[in-house]
């Protein structure tokens, strides 16, 4: 019987060319976790593993750091980087958990005041 | 440099059984999920069994369930494959392989063949 | 179960010809798709995993992609040494399964 329960940061706002860090926490489980996979859409992001460590996909090496923890860090953020991400916990003996964070990347501050001036 | 080394294949009866072990070397054995695939001649793959890196799960496919079982031996770096209640259709070359991230399949042995036959 | 169903079964090409094998899972599978190449009687070599990922000490002409249910592995450049068999495989869920093959011969 699966009694664990994923905590997730939610719903966050990044400011584009800025950095954030996902985070999922498993609780009220004693369950082993053997791996974590995070996921962005249909797309394998990174991978950290209770043995062999993380694995980052090749595409996204330069733009995603390991942790902290079971955490995932997104740097150099495009507006592109808006949408769903998934921490997939694969627990023995419980099975699969999983939690859902929106991001949402917005232009800059700066960006914005500067877009405001150049309008006659 | 990663080597996986099948053996005990051979020539048995319907109903008979053999075991299959794979010799592990030039990594940490312990550290990675194992699978066992299949080769019938002349057909494709056919994934049979894997097991996670400490050994404590386990998953067959339906065609082998309760009939094959997988192990292994950490200490021994060796993967085992017990099959029973042989028939004609297990005849194949059987693949040891390691499992990266429990996602791909990063080596393969040479394969043992298995045939069936009265 | 999930099916996974590779086209075409097999096709001739010459060296030099750029070729597509496509797969389509039976459901979404993510991006939990590997491809693999094999020659006669040899064992399978991982070729491309997590759809797009080539592995390492593969060459860059071979390429894959796709996410959800359809994927593609790309050889840009036919070389002699491609000619054999490829198969593509999900490990989205157990069971694991792999596609029928394609058979990639010389025209």
């Known amino acids: 019987m699966m009694t664990g329960t994923i905590e997730t940061t939610g719903n966050i706002s990044a400011e584009k060319g800025g950095s954030i860090i996902l985070q999922c926490h498993l609780s009220s489980t004693t369950a082993q976790v053997t791996q974590v996979n995070w996921e962005q859409q249909d797309q394998l992001l990174a991978i950290c593993n209770a043995d062999l460590g993380w694995h980052i996909s090749p595409s996204f090496k330069d733009r995603v750091a390991p942790g902290p923890g079971l955490g995932l860090t997104l740097q150099s953020l495009t507006v592109n980087d808006t949408g769903e991400y998934f921490c997939i916990y694969h627990t023995y003996p419980d099975g699969t958990y999983t939690g859902r964070i929106f991001l949402e990347v917005l232009e800059s501050s700066v960006a914005e005041h500067g877009a405001r001036f150049q309008i006659p | 440099e990663v080597q996986l080394l099948e053996s005990g294949g051979g020539l048995v009866q319907p109903g008979g059984s053999l075991r299959l072990s794979c010799a592990a070397s030039g990594f940490t054995f312990s550290s990675y999920a194992m699978h066992w695939v299949r080769q019938a001649p002349g057909k494709g793959l056919e994934w049979v069994s894997g097991i996670s890196s400490n050994g404590g799960s386990t998953s067959y496919a339906d065609s082998v369930k309760g009939r094959f079982t997988i192990s292994r031996d950490n200490s021994k770096n060796t993967l085992y494959l017990q099959m029973n209640s042989l028939r004609a259709e297990d005849t194949a070359v059987y693949y040891c392989a390691r499992v990266a991230y429990s996602v791909w399949i990063d080596y393969w042995g040479q394969g043992t063949l298995v045939t069936v036959s009265s | 179960d999930i099916q996974m169903t590779q086209s075409p079964s097999s096709l001739s090409a010459s060296v030099g010809d750029r070729v597509t094998i496509t797969c389509r899972a039976s459901q979404s599978i993510s991006s939990y798709l590997n491809w693999y190449q094999q020659k006669p009687g040899k064992a399978p070599k991982l070729l491309i995993y997590a759809a797009s990922s080539l592995q390492s000490g593969v060459p860059s002409r071979f390429s894959g992609s796709g996410s959800g249910t359809d994927f593609t592995l790309t050889i840009s450049s036919l070389q002699p040494e491609d000619f054999a068999t490829y198969y593509c495989?999900?490990?989205?869920?157990?069971?694991?399964?792999f596609g029928g093959g394609t058979k990639v011969e010389i025209k």
């Open positions: 495989q999900q490990s989205y869920s157990t069971p694991l399964t």
